[in-house]
């Protein structure tokens, strides 16, 4: 069964800066990745970035830099100030659309006890949906 993992890290140097890493553990071909915050995409979440393997990357503030890390994983750096700034309990979600598996989404946030500079382990997150 395919899985999605989400890792959230707060940068020690900039407390309003987060790095989100997501990956798809499956054999299919990824056609689109959508990163959102505040909940799953389409369920109250706000889209931060859309990564298309062929067409490029579209990102919205406060997303600063989204990138493909491998064929099946991405990273997104967020930085914000004021209303658009993420906070420690913000939930980030990654949705991978792949063929032939369909769409798989997982969400994660900073562990409650994590210090700046530490990150959640890159394990499959508890919220997992298959469309």
């Amino acid at each position: 069964t395919p899985e999605v993992w989400v890792q959230v890290r707060m940068e020690a140097t900039e407390l309003s800066s987060f790095t989100i890493r997501c990956g798809f553990l499956g054999s299919g071909s990824i056609s689109l990745v959508t990163v959102s915050w505040g909940g799953p995409n389409g369920a109250g979440g706000t889209t931060l970035a859309v990564l298309h393997p062929e067409r490029g990357i579209r990102q919205w503030a406060p997303a600063r830099q989204a990138r493909w890390e491998t064929q099946s994983s991405i990273s997104l750096i967020l930085e914000g100030s004021g209303a658009s700034s993420p906070c420690a309990n913000t939930t980030f979600c990654c949705k991978f659309a792949s063929f032939p598996e369909g769409s798989w989404e997982a969400c994660g946030s900073l562990p409650p006890s994590s210090d700046p500079g530490l990150s959640a382990p890159p394990t499959p997150a508890p919220i997992l949906r298959a469309d």
């Epitope: 990824i30 990564l51 298309h52 393997p53 062929e54 067409r55 490029g56 990357i57 579209r58 990102q59 919205w60 830099q65 989204a66 990138r67 493909w68 890390e69 491998t70 064929q71």
Partner: antibody
Framework: EVHLQQSGPELVKPGASVKISCKAS????????MNWMKQSHGKGLEWIGE????????NYSQKFRDKATLTVDKSSNTAFMKLRSLTSEDSAVYFC?????????????WGQGTSVTVSS | DIVMTQSPSSLAMSVGQKVTMSCKSS????????????LAWYQQKPGQSPKLLVS???TRESGVPDRFIGGGSGTDFTLTISSVQPEDLADYFC?????????FGEGTKLEIK
């Protein structure tokens, strides 16, 4: 054939606003984002932002977030850009450009440009 | 934002000569997903709007003469005109189309001797 027809040149006073238009033809207007660029002599080409004609969602460059407002009228296949609180720094040629078929930001068709001159 | 740097700022060539202009990006435009470089070249003739010549560093747009050749990968790119023609008098801009916001180089002005 794809064509983007922009409105004519504008001469406006400092502090005023201006709204320029870009009428699209030759393709399905709601299938592709519309981008807007500024071209001035000192700074070359700068991306202002983009709008999704399907739902009106916008995405602005941080630099132009307080300067430009992008809208569309789906019934007439027209995109608009309003520029506010104009100063001499806003004097430039402004282009609309269609999102590429193969890539979000390789813009494959451009309007002819609209010259905006800010002068008292 | 990704910074694009072009060189030279201008050059003058005779008809039939080969010309190469350069573009560098402040970070890699190579996608780890598909190994494509998201770099475009535009031609802007005097008084006209920009015209897309090349995307993905080396893919020529339909209708663009084959004397226009895009090359390079990662952070270093070139546009070569194998045999300059009088109608090639124009400004040439590179642009990264990897991610938001798309950013442009300052341009290379090609003059014909």
């Amino acid at each position: 054939e794809v064509h983007l027809q922009q409105s004519g040149p504008e001469l406006v006073k400092p502090g005023a606003s201006v709204k320029i238009s870009c009428k699209a033809s030759g393709y399905t207007f709601t299938d592709y984002y519309m981008n807007w660029m500024k071209q001035s002599h000192g700074k070359g080409l700068e991306w202002i932002g983009e709008i999704n004609p399907k739902n009106g969602d916008t995405n602005y460059s941080q630099k132009f977030r307080d300067k430009a407002t992008l809208t569309v009228d789906k019934s007439s296949n027209t995109a608009f850009m309003k520029l506010r609180s104009l100063t001499s720094e806003d004097s430039a040629v402004y282009f609309c450009a269609k999102e590429g078929v193969g890539s979000y930001y390789a813009m494959d068709y451009w309007g002819q440009g609209t010259s905006v001159t800010v002068s008292s | 934002d990704i910074v694009m740097t072009q060189s030279p700022s201008s050059l003058a060539m005779s008809v039939g000569q080969k010309v190469t202009m350069s573009c560098k990006s402040s970070q890699s435009l190579l996608s780890s997903n598909n190994q494509k470089s998201f770099l475009a070249w535009y031609q802007q003739k005097p008084g006209q709007s920009p015209k897309l010549l090349v995307s993905f560093a080396s893919t020529r747009e339909s209708g663009v003469p084959d004397r226009f050749i895009g090359g390079g990968s990662g952070t270093d790119f070139t546009l070569t005109i194998s045999s300059v023609q009088p109608e090639d008098l124009a400004d040439y801009f590179c642009q990264q189309h990897y991610s938001t916001p798309p950013t442009f180089g300052e341009g290379t002005k090609l003059e014909i001797k």
